[in-house]
Interface confidence: low
Amino acid sequence: KETAFVEVVLFESSPSGDYTTYTTGLTGRFSRAGATLSAEGEIVQMHPLGLCNNNDEEDLYEYGWVGVVKLEQPELDPKPCLTVLGKAKRAVQRGATAVIFDVSENPEAIDQLNQGSEDPLKRPVVYVKGADAIKLMNIVNKQKVARARIQHRPPRQPTEYFDM
């Protein structure tokens, strides 16, 4: 279970055409459900139930986005439509280049993602928790253009990371 180094860039523009770019860094873990690869793309927040929809015509995005899914407490969804692994697969089928799960509320998902699938996804499936997850969700919840770069080694140059 290697460390995943995630750099998130938030892009905020104003009507005047001015803009600000914020960078923050966090760490997660590559799960065995996916590949230990670098990936990058625009962040698309996905609700766990949103991944239940089987209609592939709906909710398709251009290829190359990074899906971010905050998993809920198991008690809130006792009979999930898909396993966590199934949700990751569904996101990749829809064009995600990587999936990041916030497992803070559902730590059991870590074991599910690391059970060593016979047919792991060819894209990275990363999980984050604790302070790193809070950082990530703070950015995602801003509903602004944000981009995630996932690397399996630390960034080449030290980037100063700022809490949002």
Epitope: F11, D18, T20, T21, E40, G64, R147, E160
Partner: antibody
Framework: EVQLVESGGGLVKPGGSLRLSCAAS????????MSWVRQAPGKGLEWVGF??????????EYAASVKGRFTISRDDSKNTLYLQMNSLKTEDTAVYYC????????????WGQGTLVTVSS | DIELTQPPSVSVSPGQTASITCSGD??????VHWYQQKPGQAPVLVIY???QRPSGIPERFSGSNSGNTATLTISGTQAEDEADYYC???????????FGGGTKLTVLG
């Protein structure tokens, strides 16, 4: 009006050094991620390098062709971007443009008019 | 790095549609941007993120990107559109910004 104005170009001998400046106005320079792009006479565009803003830790990255010889820096208090060019080669002869970058430095939405650097003996 | 290949030249009659292509390995999984450059002038961004048009750019400019090819389309081409056009992408694997070789668009007549 959003504007970028380059200066500092000129004739320099191979192995020599030169520093280009780019004065920015009409936008919040300290927020911007800035880049240099060059164009050899009669040729296409070539990305040179970039610098992130303060929030990005002023990180810089360079094209392989200039790495180790060129250094990008900025002075936010003066709204100015710099390109320090050392160990210049004849193939560095080009018009050098500074450009503002948008969307994680994918695209360049504002360009200066360019300044010509000629490296010749 | 990803390499972007453009045809050196494209000719079109006024009022017709001009299509300029940019090809590269799996280019459809990258964002592609297009610039127009007239002689002696700086480049101008005409399309970003495959198909977005900056404010001030006429609606006749449009873009698409899928598979290995991105295309800049100029419908109802006008004489003032005669220029060099460059595609560009951000190759995040190598953290470099890559330009195509450029295409000279000639408006006949």
């Amino acid at each position: 009006e959003v504007q970028l104005v380059e200066s500092g170009g000129g004739l320099v001998k191979p192995g020599g050094s030169l520093r280009l400046s780019c004065a920015a106005s009409g936008f919040t320079f300290s927020n911007a991620w800035m880049s240099w792009v060059r164009q050899a006479p009669g040729k296409g565009l070539e990305w040179v390098g970039f610098t992130k803003n303060e929030v990005g830790g002023y990180t810089t990255e360079y094209a392989a062709s200039v790495k180790g010889r060129f250094t990008i820096s900025r002075d936010d208090s003066k709204n100015t971007l710099y390109l320090q060019m050392n160990s210049l080669k004849t193939e560095d002869t080009a018009v050098y443009y500074c450009a503002r970058a948008i969307y994680y430095l994918e695209a360049f939405d504002v360009w200066g008019q360019g300044t010509l650097v000629t490296v010749s003996s | 790095d990803i390499e972007l290949t453009q045809p050196p030249s494209v000719s079109v009659s006024p009022g017709q549609t001009a299509s300029i292509t940019c090809s590269g390995d799996s280019l459809g999984s990258y964002y592609v941007h297009w610039y127009q450059q007239k002689p002696g002038q700086a480049p101008v961004l005409v399309i970003y993120r495959n198909k977005q048009r900056p404010s001030g750019i006429p609606e006749r400019f449009s873009g698409s990107n899928s598979g290995n090819t991105a295309t800049l389309t100029i419908s109802g081409t006008q004489a003032e559109d005669e220029a060099d056009y460059y595609c560009q992408t951000y190759d995040w694997m190598y953290s470099s910004r890559v330009f195509g070789g450029g295409t000279k668009l000639t408006v006949l007549g």
